[in-house]
C-alpha cells in the first residue's frame, strides 16, 4: 500500500481543515488508514482523524481544531496499521478556503432597489471576520446568457442594485461567495442560492 498523491490540506481558519490524498489502488480509507495530526505547541495532544473514501483510491479527512492563530503549524502522519506511509506538515494560514456565507436574502420592497444581504460566516473573534470580501452571482433562470457577477469589496455583507438593471417579469437567482486577500485565500464555496421574481415599474415615457 502506497500513497500515490500526497495529502493536500485546506483550512477554514476556524475549526476544520480538510486533507485529501490518493492511494495507489482501491482502499477502504476508514478501516485501513489513520491520519494523525498534532499542533506544534506546548500542551498539544495528538489527534486521530478517520478518513472517508473520496472515489475509489481517494481519501478525505476532516481535522478538527479548537482555534487557529497565524503561526500555527501541524505535523501530519498517515498510517496504515503500524506502517507510516507519509509524514508532512501543514500551516493552516497558508492554505485558507473561507467558509461559505449564509442566509442570503433578497429584499424586494425597497422602492425599485434590490437589497441583497447575507451573513458573515465567521464570529467576531476570528481574524477573517473583518477581512472578507464577496462576489455575488445573479443569473436568470430563463436566459443562460443573463449571468452577472458583482464584486463586493467593502466589509458590509450586502449589495444594493437597481431592479431596473435586471429584466422585469422574470425570475432570478443569486448566490454569494467569499475570499480574504490578507491570507491570499481561495474562494469559498457558493452559498445556497435564493430565488425571487423581479418586477418593477417601468418609467413612464413621455412623447
Amino acid at each position: 500500500m502506497k500513497v500515490l498523491q500526497e495529502p493536500t490540506c485546506v483550512s477554514d481558519y476556524m475549526s476544520i481543515s480538510t486533507c485529501e490524498w490518493k492511494m495507489n489502488g482501491p482502499t477502504n480509507c476508514s478501516t485501513e488508514l489513520r491520519l494523525l495530526y498534532q499542533l506544534v505547541f506546548l500542551l498539544s495532544e495528538a489527534h486521530t482523524c478517520i478518513p472517508e473514501n473520496n472515489g475509489g483510491a481517494g481519501c478525505v479527512c476532516h481535522l478538527l481544531m479548537d482555534d487557529v492563530v497565524s503561526a500555527d503549524n501541524y505535523t501530519l502522519d498517515l498510517w496504515a496499521g503500524q506502517q507510516l506511509l507519509w509524514k508532512g506538515s501543514f500551516k493552516p494560514s497558508e492554505h485558507v478556503k473561507p467558509r461559505a456565507p449564509g442566509n442570503l436574502t433578497v429584499h424586494t420592497n425597497v422602492s425599485d432597489t434590490l437589497l441583497l444581504t447575507w451573513s458573515n460566516p465567521y464570529p467576531p473573534d476570528n481574524y477573517l471576520y473583518n477581512h472578507l470580501t464577496y462576489a455575488v452571482n445573479i443569473w436568470s433562470e430563463n436566459d443562460p446568457a443573463d449571468f452577472r457577477i458583482y464584486n463586493v469589496t467593502y466589509l458590509e455583507p450586502s449589495l444594493r442594485i437597481a431592479a431596473s438593471t435586471l429584466k422585469s417579469g422574470i425570475s432570478y437567482r443569486a448566490r454569494v461567495r467569499a475570499w480574504a486577500q490578507c491570507y491570499n485565500t481561495t474562494w469559498s464555496e457558493w452559498s445556497p442560492s435564493t430565488k425571487w421574481h423581479n418586477s418593477y415599474r417601468e418609467p413612464f415615457e413621455q412623447h
Partner: antibody, heavy 116, light 112 residues
Framework: QVQLQQSGAELVKPGASVKLSCTAS????????MHWVKQRPEQGLEWVGR????????IYASKFQGKATITADTSSNTAYMQLSSLTSEDTAVYHC?????????WGQGTTLTVSS | DIVMTQTPLSLSVTPGQPASISCRSS???????????LEWYLQKPGQSPQLLIY???NRFSGVPDRFSGSGSGTDFTLKISRVEAEDVGVYYC?????????FGQGTKLEIK
C-alpha cells in the same frame, strides 16, 4: 520552563496613561493568543481583550474599548497593554494570560494604583 | 454580553466531604465550531488563577481526579468529590465561546 513575567507595580495619577508589559519565556507568543484580565480589589475577574501577536488582530470587551490598547512585539516575545485616561476605577491587578485554547499560563499580575 | 451566574457565592466544607458549584450562562455557549468553551479556574489566596477544567469536562494536566466538570447548554457544574485543605480559594467559571468572554462572579470555598 513556561513563564509569563509581568512588569512591576505602578502608582499613577488620575488622567495619566500607563503601559504594562508581559514577557513570555519557554514558548513563542506567536503561537498563542495573549489576553489581559482585570481583577479589582476583593472582586472577580474581568476579561479585557486579546491579541493575535502575529497579525496584531485585537478584540476588546466593549467597556474597555478606548480605555485599553493591546499590542505585541514578537521580536522580544512581549505583550503590552496601555491604559489611558486613568481613574480610580482602573485600580486593579492586571493579569496577562496566554490562551491556546484555554488559559493555561497566567502572569503573576501587575498591581496598578491610580491615586493623586 | 453573556452573563455567567455562579451559585453559591460561598461555601464552607468539612475536609473529605463533597462540594458542588453551579454555573449558569444567560444564553447558549456553544461556539460556532460546535465546541463548548466552558472552563473552571481556581484562584488560591495570593496567587494567580489556575486552570482546572476545560471544555466542560476535561481535567487539565496535573489536576487531581477529585475535580470533575459536567453540564451542557446553559447549565454547568464543578464537583469536588472529597474536599482537601489545599482546595481553598475562589472558583470561577468562564465562557470562551462568544465575545466578550466572561467570568462568573466567583465562589469562595473555605474549610470548616
Amino acid at each position: 520552563q513556561v513563564q509569563l513575567q509581568q512588569s512591576g507595580a505602578e502608582l499613577v495619577k488620575p488622567g495619566a496613561s500607563v503601559k504594562l508589559s508581559c514577557t513570555a519565556s519557554g514558548f513563542n507568543i506567536k503561537d498563542t493568543y495573549m489576553h489581559w484580565v482585570k481583577q479589582r480589589p476583593e472582586q472577580g475577574l474581568e476579561w479585557v481583550g486579546r491579541i493575535d501577536p502575529t497579525n496584531g488582530y485585537t478584540i476588546y470587551a466593549s467597556k474597555f474599548q478606548g480605555k485599553a490598547t493591546i499590542t505585541a512585539d514578537t521580536s522580544s516575545n512581549t505583550a503590552y497593554m496601555q491604559l489611558s485616561s486613568l481613574t480610580s476605577e482602573d485600580t486593579a491587578v492586571y493579569h496577562c494570560v496566554s490562551r491556546r485554547p484555554w488559559f493555561a499560563y497566567w502572569g503573576q499580575g501587575t498591581t496598578l494604583t491610580v491615586s493623586s | 454580553d453573556i452573563v455567567m451566574t455562579q451559585t453559591p457565592l460561598s461555601l464552607s466544607v468539612t475536609p473529605g466531604q463533597p462540594a458542588s458549584i453551579s454555573c449558569r450562562s444567560s444564553q447558549s455557549i456553544v461556539h460556532s465550531n460546535g465546541n463548548t468553551y466552558l472552563e473552571w479556574y481556581l484562584q488560591k489566596p495570593g496567587q494567580s488563577p489556575q486552570l482546572l477544567i476545560y471544555k466542560v469536562t476535561n481535567r487539565f494536566s496535573g489536576v487531581p481526579d477529585r475535580f470533575s466538570g459536567s453540564g451542557s447548554g446553559t447549565d454547568f457544574t464543578l464537583k469536588i468529590s472529597r474536599v482537601e485543605a489545599e482546595d481553598v480559594g475562589v472558583y470561577y467559571c468562564f465562557q470562551g465561546s462568544h465575545v466578550p468572554y466572561t467570568f462568573g462572579q466567583g465562589t469562595k470555598l473555605e474549610i470548616k
